[in-house]
């Protein structure tokens, strides 16, 4: 309706004497801003005066004066949308209707709000879920239709008068829609909480009691049971009687059915609170409990372990493990049903009693072949001795024993011979099925356990065989001791380590990798000439003339072997330098003269330097110095210097004579 002012606020607000009331409020005027506001208590419209009568709790005046009452009542709104009010403290006689008289420049409006103030604090209200079951989490809610900024309060939860440990979540609402304080408590009730009193207590800021609400918990739970047994230790002998009684300590709702279970399985036709077992047998040993159900579900008692005692039954032997490997450990277990458990055991190996073995288990840490055979046992408890059952067979397996490799040939063996070997052993379990040989080669095995090596190599030093069943047993290697001529003969320079320079002390070594027999002789040769018969060839001061191709020979009683030819290279500084002149040392002016620096050097000369009779270097660095046309002034002594990576050498002086030509002489 466009002719109405629009207000939003809670319809009714609740408080108590001495507290306060906070009224959240919004509005929209028909036109323009608010010019006048009066808060009435129980306003009545006077038709005669066309005005409202009633107690004025608050009035906004144009001169700005505030009546004393306005200290208690505050208008917290504004001129266009907020009309929030606060009354602090609030009194019992404030109950009733509050009238908000609003006037704009052209329009007027009276808005009514209900205020309910009680004499003392009213109680909160506890809300419970429709059904509570044990161990299922529920939320308890405590709601109070009150909240005010000027009057802090708290809600506390109690169980049977004792504060609850669980943390509660408190929330407040002060909105135009609702005003309340709420506390929510999450709680997992147990069956023992059934019938207990829960209280929500309203307290002021100092924790002083103001009011409360209480509820009694109705916790649905399965029946809670206790079981009693006669005899109390539940240990009997075959033929005795046993009585078990089931008592219900709590059930909500009431129980409906009763049953008994043995080892988790229901016993037929046992639907009373007492279970009588007459003349029990050993099969009736087990775990018993009673089960009582209600609408929530079944409840079970604790289990009673009924033990029916009897003498040991015929025993069996379990072997861990058979067949057993020699050297491994084996455990024998005597298995015999008995109650109480057997206290003594007697063990037999191949029918003969094993002394000192009285335990349920026999442990042999290291099995040997003689441990094989049949094992049996007898068990004994306080009620008697059992019978010896069928025995268990232990099979002890072991690798082949005392394996040897035998050479069938006459000794010594020479490189290239045919060699036959056999592989022998003493005993084996299981039987030998194959043989292996080390090292592996492309060799013949003419029959099982025999090896034939055609054209035996110089390096066939040792051979070993293995006889194999599930395992291989290796014989000690046998030395073939193959005899051969010296091998891998080579010349090795041992001094100097780097390149050989003229004047160095040089040692060459005649190396070979192996020889059998070891006794050897050496021979050195250069260009077919015998030089020495030692393993080393030494030069105290090597000269360029010692360069050349060297070989060494090593021989033993089987044969002789030569090295590859080894080239000895001697590095030396330029030597034997001389200046040669072409066409000769006397040349006519105007012709061409070529001076050549001749030298002997290793490595070759890298560059030359030419000098004149004044020791002045000439700007020429090649081997030849060409003077063209030659002049009389070129006459004189020349010398050259050659340089390589080893060093330097220089020539003696050579004199060039340049004589005048007939033309020059004619002109004079």
């Amino acid at each position: 309706d466009s002719s109405k002012w629009v207000f939003e606020h809670p319809e009714t607000l609740y408080a108590w004497e001495g507290a306060c009331v906070w009224i959240p409020c919004t509005y929209r005027a028909l036109d323009g801003d608010l010019e006048s506001f009066i808060l009435f208590h129980n306003p009545e419209y006077n038709k005669n005066t066309s005005k409202f009568d009633g107690t004025r709790l608050y009035e906004s005046t144009k001169d700005g004066k505030v009546p004393s009452e306005q200290k208690r009542v505050q208008f917290l709104g504004d001129k266009n949308k907020n009309c929030t009010l606060s009354i602090h403290p609030v009194h019992l006689n404030d109950s009733g209707q509050l009238g908000l008289r609003m006037e704009s420049k052209t329009e007027k409006w009276m808005e009514r709000i209900h205020l309910n103030v009680s004499e003392r604090p009213f109680p909160p209200h506890i809300q419970l879920p429709p059904e509570i079951q044990e161990s299922q989490e529920v939320t308890l809610t405590c709601l109070l239709n009150f909240s005010c900024y000027g009057y802090p309060i708290q809600l506390q939860w109690l169980l049977e008068g004792v504060p609850m440990r669980q943390a509660a979540v408190t929330s407040t609402s002060l909105t135009i829609k609702s005003v309340f304080t709420r506390s929510e408590l999450k709680f997992s009730p147990q069956w023992s909480h059934h019938g207990k009193i829960v209280t929500c207590q309203l307290q002021d800021a100092d924790g002083k009691f103001l009011s409360n609400d209480t509820v009694q918990l109705n916790v649905k739970h399965t029946p809670k049971l206790e079981i009693k047994v006669t005899p109390s230790d539940a240990i009997v002998r075959e033929g005795d009687s046993v009585t078990m009684t089931c008592e219900v300590s709590s059930s909500n709702p009431e129980y409906t059915t009763v049953s008994w279970l043995k080892d988790g399985t229901s016993l037929k036709k046992q639907n009373t609170f007492t279970l009588n077992l007459r003349e029990v047998t050993k099969d009736q040993s087990g775990k018993y409990c009673c089960q009582v159900s209600n609408d929530v579900g079944p409840g079970r008692s604790e289990e009673v372990f009924l033990q029916v005692q009897y003498a040991p039954e015929p025993s069996t032997v379990q072997i861990l493990h058979s067949p057993a490997v020699e050297g491994s450990q084996v455990e024998f277990l005597c298995m015999s049903l008995a109650n109480p458990l057997p206290t003594n055991y007697t063990w037999y190996h191949n029918g003969k009693e094993m002394q000192g073995r009285t335990e349920e288990k026999v442990h042999i840490p290291k099995i040997l072949p003689w441990h094989a055979g049949t094992y049996s046992c007898v068990a004994e408890n306080i009620l008697g001795t059992g019978q010896r059952g069928p025995g268990a067979e232990l099979d002890v397996q072991y690798p082949p024993k005392k394996v040897t490799t035998v050479i069938q040939n006459p000794m010594p063996i020479r490189e290239g011979d045919t060699v036959t070997l056999s592989c022998n052993y003493n005993s084996s379990n299981p039987s030998v099925t194959r043989y292996e040989w080390k090292p592996h080669g492309a060799w013949e095995e003419p029959s099982l356990g025999v090896l034939k090596i055609q054209n035996v190599g110089w390096d066939n030093t040792t051979i070993a065989c293995a006889a194999c069943n599930s395992w291989c047993s290796w014989a000690s290697p046998v030395a073939l001791n193959v005899q051969y001529a010296p091998r891998d003969v080579r010349v090795r320079k041992i001094k100097p380590l780097s390149e050989i320079h003229s004047g160095n002390s040089v040692s060459l070594q005649c190396d070979f990798s192996s020889s059998h027999p070891k006794e050897v002789q050496f021979f050195w040769e250069k260009n077919g000439r015998l030089l020495g018969k030692e393993s080393q060839l030494n030069f105290d001061s090597i000269s360029p003339e010692d360069a050349g191709s060297y070989s060494c020979w090593v021989n033993n009683s089987i044969g002789q072997t030569a090295s590859k030819a080894w080239t000895l290279e001697v590095l030396y500084a330029p030597r034997r330098l001389r200046v040669s002149m072409s066409p000769g040392d006397q040349v006519m002016e105007g012709k061409s003269a070529t001076l050549t620096c001749e030298s002997d050097a290793n490595p070759p000369v890298s560059h030359y330097t030419w000098f004149d009779w004044n020791n002045q270097s000439l700007p020429y660095h090649s081997q030849k110095l060409r003077l063209e046309p030659v002049k009389v002034q070129h006459s004189g002594a020349y010398w050259c210097q050659g340089t390589n990576s080893v060093g330097k050498g220089r020539s003696p002086l050579s004199t060039l004579t340049v004589y005048y030509s007939p033309e020059t002489i004619g002109r004079r």
Epitope: A573, H607, G647, R650
Partner: antibody
Framework: QVQLQQSGPGLVKHSQTLSLTCAIS??????????WNWIRQSPSRGLEWLGR?????????DYAVSVKSRITINPDTSKNQFSLQLNSVTPEDTAVYYC????????????WGQGTMVTVSS | DIQMTQSPSSVYASVGDKVTITCRAS??????LAWYQQKPGLAPQLLIS???TLQGEVPSRFSGSGSGTDFTLTISSLQPEDFATYYC?????????FGQGTKLEIK
Amino acid sequence: QVQLQQSGPGLVKHSQTLSLTCAISGDSVSSNSAAWNWIRQSPSRGLEWLGRTYYRSKWYNDYAVSVKSRITINPDTSKNQFSLQLNSVTPEDTAVYYCAQEVEPHDAFDIWGQGTMVTVSS
Amino acid sequence: DIQMTQSPSSVYASVGDKVTITCRASQDVSGWLAWYQQKPGLAPQLLISGASTLQGEVPSRFSGSGSGTDFTLTISSLQPEDFATYYCQQAKYFPYTFGQGTKLEIK
């Protein structure tokens, strides 16, 4: 009158590179009758020739075997100088380093630089 | 490498004395031998090259002789400025090598 002026750091860290320069005045690094050398002196090894560079139609180098794998001597014709680089130095390389001119035909060191004391710190 | 051995390692003499220092090469170095003088904190200074050629500004009291493997440096009449360390050096083979030095000290 030929003069040689050395420059470069006096302290080098272990395993780093020693670099020195020798500036020539009064002659050319490309001279056809001179060679340019580096020599060092230490109490333990005395005077030790390290190597040389020289020009005879092309550039040549000769190095001492003891440092051959670590040494480089380079001429710089644009600045008329030559340099020494010695890699992977150790405290054993601590010495006074000299540059020197060698002149044919006697091939002796007639002009020396002022010397640079180089310490290798570990 | 060519070994250069100087003897003696040190020599004590007075002003006006004649002093002889010898240098032996482990191999023939022809005439490629030089002699140097070094004073503390300074670079060596060339005295003689080619075994016997005196450098331009070196006083005539210094002389050198020898060829092949054995060489000699002679100072005919010692002057106060001659007290220093003297080194020989071969220049025939690479690497060039120096003697260990002879220290000339005032008696």
